[in-house]
Interface confidence: medium
């Protein structure tokens, strides 16, 4: 439970007072306010929203609210030279062109500055050639094409369906396969749930709807021109040729009406199996090129987008801690959107706004948290997590010494079925305890706890009677805090039923149809799921900032470390002969995990018993908890990914959205049977086992008794 002794306030100012102050009606009002016009990063509209949020957070009662600006590389379509794709005949005449914009939703016909669908950071170019259908453009899809089907993508334009993995990984894979252009499209199999109408009559994607998004492979670098350092006014900027993570081939997204026109003519090889078929009435032939009658026709891309150094603005609000002002708990979510941002990000920003208002109300009544709370409205998340990363780069020395926790607050909903949480194992017990205290908003669970409905609908695959909590991957603003700086992090939102809904994300993701009405009519008319997410995010922040002993349980890290070690060992054991030949042993890793488990257990015992009235000892124990996540950071980073420094978790090299455990070992083992120099490859596996074992042992020792 929270304790208020140290903050000198009346008993009514506890977690309950904070939670009771959160109101669904306010979240609804804020969401409406934030979604009436587009707030694209780098635009005047988004700057004005930053100033509005700054002003309102000041009114709510924060101690200070500042704008932090950076000049970063962004990407925009050319207003006078639109991007499109055409089918051309043998004379070079364009016989079909893809649409230049999405038909605007009802009520938004006269809104200006709706950016047309584009792939941010695509280079300019007008490649033409034969088409190859590459399914989701995952690593395994290209293996299937190249190794099994012997189809060469070199010099071809590939068409890939959105879903399963981050779009930047798709583009990287296509580049490595030698493609000269990429067309991304939304297949109804992934973005049209059966039995639901398309927008505006339901929450499904219409044929003219298109998903925008960046196609970078930044690997945590932030601004492509200033990796590792803030993009301030005196930054040394790389030239575009040396920029980090930019794609080298033109890329453009389309909807399924336009995709139908391209895919219906495909010839060449038949799809290898049913997993390559979507829901369009087309054969899903792989190609290359068009079938018989159309074999002389080609596809041509016309991409004229430009990369521009542009000013962005974060809003940073501070609520100073009464007892430990030099310990920071951060709640952050982005403000920039592709268009209206009805879900992404404003359903999250509206929740943050209400959380700030509630904290401000308590502060006006004389309360302060024990630790400092920082609130952030990040800019340019959609362009590669740029606002959060630049701010963290600028403040890295403070953050690595003072950062207790980071709670992310992007979209509050991606469905309305149950809770979804991804976090460090240190927060498992905090999340469990908190959700047991909150009421479930779900139908059929009236009077029951959120923990109960969540556990029933999303059970843990390992532990019965517990809910699923996932690993942190990336694709959101916690990345720099967790993967680079080693600050304990977590995120929570309401999600869909993954069992019955096989589509990727939510259908209208990053389209013009992501409006206030989408949320208010179809996802959460009562805003009860938004309120629940506000209670979870806000409750986590409250506990992290206010509990006398940090609500971290190091024993949960011990449990997952053993699980991850078992998993990576079993992957390696698929190659028993090579392990023997090259003397590959996991003994050091298992030994380190065993030591960690024992030391964590002893630390937890001491945590129960120590004298909490001794401020020095209290601070010492809390610091050991705070710095445990930091202890998993390797200053040298992962191979070829210097900004991914967490040894236990990193975004998957094949899907930025997904988290991988023991990523150094995992990547060293990946596809090892195809490596040209097996001795060198297995040597790298051994080195990565050593790094992991050392890091786990070193982390364990931070929990030992200090003297």
């Amino acid at each position: 439970k929270s304790s208020n002794e140290a903050t000198n306030i009346t008993p009514k100012h506890n977690m309950k007072a904070f939670l009771d102050e959160l109101k669904a009606e306010n979240i609804k009002k804020f969401l409406y306010n934030f979604t009436q016009i587009p707030h694209l990063a780098g635009t005047e509209q988004n700057f004005q929203l930053a100033k509005q949020i700054q002003s309102q957070w000041k009114e709510f009662g924060l101690d200070s609210v500042e704008l932090a600006h950076y000049d970063v590389l962004l990407s925009y379509p050319n207003k006078t030279h639109p991007n499109y794709i055409s089918i051309i005949n043998e004379d070079g005449n364009e016989i079909f062109n893809t649409s230049l914009f999405e038909p605007p939703p009802p009520g938004y016909e006269n809104v200006s500055d709706i950016v047309p669908p584009f792939s941010a950071f695509s280079p300019q170019g007008m490649p033409e050639g034969d088409l190859v259908y590459v399914n989701y453009a995952r690593t395994e899809d290209f293996f299937k094409l190249e190794r099994d089907m012997k189809i060469n993508c070199s010099g071809k334009i590939v068409i890939a369906r959105y879903g399963k993995v981050f779009r930047g990984n798709k583009v990287k894979n296509a580049q490595l396969a030698g493609a000269k252009g990429v067309i991304l499209y939304s297949d109804p199999a992934d973005y049209f749930a059966p039995g639901v109408k398309s927008y505006p009559d339901g929450w499904n994607l219409p044929g003219g709807g298109v998903q925008r998004g960046n196609i970078l492979n930044l690997n945590g670098a932030g601004d492509p021109l200033t990796p590792g350092y803030p993009a301030n006014e005196y930054a040394y900027r790389r030239g575009i040729a040396e920029a980090v993570g930019l794609p080298s081939i033109p890329v453009h997204p389309i909807g399924y009406y336009d995709a139908q026109k391209l895919l219906e003519k495909m010839g060449g090889s038949a799809p290898p199996d049913s997993s390559w078929r979507g829901s369009l009435k087309v054969p899903y032939n792989v190609g290359p090129g068009f079938t018989g009658n159309f074999s002389t026709q080609k596809v041509k891309m016309h991409i004229h987008s430009t990369n521009e150094v542009t000013r962005i603005y974060n809003v940073i609000g501070t609520l100073r801690g009464a007892v430990e002002p030099d310990r920071y708990v951060i709640l952050g979510g982005h403000r920039d959107s592709w268009v209206f941002g009805g879900i992404d990000p404003q359903s999250g920003a509206a929740v943050v706004h209400e959380i700030v208002r509630s904290f401000g109300t308590l502060k006006k009544e004389g309360w302060r948290p024990r630790r400092t709370i920082l609130f952030a409205s990040w800019d340019a998340e959609e362009f590669g997590l740029l606002g959060s990363t630049e701010w963290a780069e600028e403040n890295s020395r403070l953050l690595q010494e003072r950062g207790v926790a980071y709670i992310n607050a992007d979209s509050s909903i991606e469905g309305n079925y149950t809770l979804r949480v991804d976090c460090t194992p240190l927060m498992y017990s905090l999340v469990h305890n908190l959700t047991k205290e909150l009421k479930s908003p779900d139908e059929g669970f009236e009077g029951k706890s959120l923990y109960e409905s969540w556990t029933k609908k999303s059970p843990s695959p390992e532990f019965s009677g517990m809910p699923r909590i996932s690993k942190l991957g990336s694709g959101n603003d916690f990345e720099v805090f967790f993967q680079r700086l080693g600050i304990a992090s977590g995120r929570a939102r309401y999600t869909k039923n993954w069992e019955t809904n096989k589509f990727s994300g939510y259908p209208l993701y990053h389209s013009v149809y992501e409006t206030y009405e989408l949320v208010e009519k179809f996802y959460d008319p009562m805003f009860k799921y938004h309120l629940t997410v506000a209670q979870v995010r806000g409750g986590m922040v409250f506990e992290l900032a206010n509990s006398i002993v940090l609500p971290f349980d190091c024993r949960d890290y011990a449990v997952v470390l053993r699980k991850y070690a078992d998993k990576i060992y079993s992957i390696s054991m698929k190659h028993p002969q090579e392990m023997k030949t090259y003397s590959v042993s996991f003994d050091s890793l298992f030994s380190a995990v065993k030591n960690f488990t024992e030391i964590a257990s002893k630390f937890s015992e001491r945590l129960q018993d120590f004298d909490k009235s001794n401020p020095i000892v209290l601070r010492m124990m809390n610091d050991q908890l705070m710095f445990l996540e930091r202890a998993f950071i390797d200053p040298l980073g992962l191979p070829d990914r210097p900004f991914y420094r967490h040894v236990i978790y990193a975004p998957s090299s094949h899907n930025k959205y997904a988290g991988e455990s023991f990523p150094g070992i995992y990547d060293a083992l990946f596809d090892i049977e195809s490596k040209v120099d097996p001795s060198k490859a297995w040597g790298e596996v051994k080195r990565q086992i050593y790094v992991a074992a050392f890091t786990v042992q070193a982390a364990a020792e931070t929990l030992s008794e200090v003297a």
């Epitope: 600006h69 000049d71 301030n232 006014e233 005196y234 040394y236 900027r237 790389r238 030239g239 575009i240 040729a241 990369n307 521009e308 150094v309």
Partner: antibody
Framework: VKLQESGPGLVAPSQSLSITCTVS????????VSWIRQPPGKGLEWLGV???????YYNSPLKSRLSINKDNSKSQVFLKMNSLQTDDSAMYYC??????????WGQGTSVTVSS | STVLTQSPAIMSASPGEKVTMTCRAS???????LHWYQQKSSASPKLWIY???NLASGVPARFSGSGSGTSYSLTISSLEAEDAATYYC?????????FGAGTKLELK
């Protein structure tokens, strides 16, 4: 956006020069300000910059003689140059500094170094 | 620091003519960081073309810029009387910022 320089006009050799640049239409907490000079009939020479956070950079040949300061609340930037010689006679401009460009310029103030 | 050499130093052309002036850098400059300014007599310079090829607000479409590496150019497709001025290129490849000596464009 407007920038306006004001200076003494005439400075005696070996004396120091002080010029004030008053800006409007933007905040000095958001943008830096560069100083540039142009001797009569000659080209442009970049002198230095004060960025929004107060950090400065001075062009090497002038580093020992130059200082740039500002008062954000008054929207003013100050250039001070010591030990002036006749070849420091020039039109002195302030300009808003935006990612390595000067996107808005003042009308300039003429400085003559003469006894 | 990077030295910019503009050529010609002075040029004259008739209205309607196509005009090109060049700016050469002593070491490679990113196209993102090469800019042009126009200065008319007894007036302050104006940002004219930024990041090699982007026209500043209010600049007529007859102006264009191009180049990469060490060689850049400013072109006027059809000269008009109001274009008579001195044009300076300016670069960043690390501080200090430097200007070229200028190309003075006169009308015949």
């Amino acid at each position: 956006v407007k920038l306006q320089e004001s200076g003494p006009g005439l400075v005696a050799p070996s004396q120091s020069l002080s010029i004030t640049c008053t800006v409007s239409g933007f905040s000095l907490t958001d943008y830096g300000v560069s100083w540039i000079r142009q001797p009569p009939g000659k080209g442009l020479e970049w002198l230095g910059v004060i960025w929004s956070d107060g950090n400065t950079y001075y062009n090497s040949p002038l580093k020992s003689r130059l200082s740039i300061n500002k008062d954000n609340s008054k929207s003013q930037v100050f250039l001070k140059m010591n030990s002036l010689q006749t070849d420091d006679s020039a039109m002195y401009y302030c300009a808003r500094h935006k990612v390595y460009t000067m996107d808005y310029w003042g009308q300039g103030t003429s400085v003559t170094v003469s006894s | 620091s990077t030295v910019l050499t503009q050529s010609p130093a002075i040029m004259s052309a008739s209205p309607g003519e196509k005009v090109t002036m060049t700016c050469r850098a002593s070491s490679s400059v990113s196209s993102s960081y090469l800019h042009w300014y126009q200065q008319k007599s007894s007036a302050s310079p104006k940002l004219w073309i930024y990041r090699t090829s982007n026209l500043a607000s209010g600049v007529p479409a007859r102006f264009s810029g191009s180049g990469s590496g060490t060689s850049y150019s400013l072109t006027i497709s059809s000269l008009e009387a109001e274009d008579a001025a001195t044009y300076y290129c300016q670069q960043y490849s690390g501080y200090p910022l430097t200007f070229g000596a200028g190309t003075k464009l006169e009308l015949k």
